[in-house]
């Protein structure tokens, strides 16, 4: 029986060009975490295997950094990064636990409005 629960950072927002940490935490189970896969709308971002370490998908290598912990850091955010992210905990013997995070990337207020104002 699956008794665990996943806590996530929930719905978060960040500015374009900035960075954000995606975090999930599995609790209330003694199951062994064998691997955590991070996905963005059915696209693999990264893998953290408990014994073998991290793998960052080639298409995200420039903008994704492993950690902290089993979390994931997204850098140089663009508005196209807005959307759902999933942490998929593969555990033994429980099975798979999935957490969801919604990220909204906002246009920077400085980038959007800064040019309209002149400093005398």
């Amino acid at each position: 029986m699956m008794t665990g629960t996943i806590e996530t950072t929930g719905n978060i927002s960040a500015e374009k060009g900035g960075s954000i940490i995606l975090q999930c935490h599995l609790s209330s189970t003694t199951a062994q975490v064998t691997q955590v896969n991070w996905e963005q709308q059915d696209q693999l971002l990264a893998i953290c295997n408990a014994d073998l370490g991290w793998h960052i998908s080639p298409s995200f290598k420039d903008r994704v950094a492993p950690g902290p912990g089993l979390g994931l850091t997204l850098q140089s955010l663009t508005v196209n990064d807005t959307g759902e992210y999933f942490c998929i905990y593969h555990t033994y013997p429980d099975g798979t636990y999935t957490g969801r995070i919604f990220l909204e990337v906002l246009e920077s207020s400085v980038a959007e409005h800064g040019a309209r104002f002149q400093i005398p």
């Epitope: 896969n37 996905e39 295997n49 593969h90 798979t96």
Partner: nanobody, 116 residues
């Protein structure tokens, strides 16, 4: 769900070689990784090798690095583990596991016994 069937285990003398195979059938959704784990008596299951579906990157535990080689034949839906220079401490049940965007599927395991 993916059905995984391992083969190739057995009894071998120290210093010998074995090649494990893991054939998959069934719906695979979006394949992410194929890996090999092992579990020795009284110990936790440990990951020893992994190959990724996106670029074929391979990863190895320090205990098997330089002795074991993982490979995949996508046309046959099969992943292999070539094990050379086997040691008595490699004795364990070996499991293959595939992860997809939906979950993780395990094989039933194959026994590898290395005698000294």
């Amino acid at each position: 769900e993916v059905q995984l069937v391992e083969s190739g285990g057995g009894l071998v003398q120290a210093g010998g070689s074995l090649r494990l195979s893991c054939a998959a059938s069934g719906r695979a959704f979006s394949l992410r990784t194929m890996g090999w784990f092992r579990q020795a008596p009284g110990k936790e299951r440990e990951g020893i090798s992994l190959i990724t579906s996106d670029d074929g990157s391979t990863y190895y535990a320090d205990s098997v690095k330089g002795r074991f080689t993982i490979s995949a034949d996508n046309a046959k839906n099969t992943v292999y583990l070539q094990m050379n220079s086997l040691k008595p401490e490699d004795t364990a049940v070996y499991y293959c596991a595939w992860t997809t965007n939906r979950g993780m599927d395990w094989g039933q395991g194959t026994q590898v016994t290395v005698s000294s």
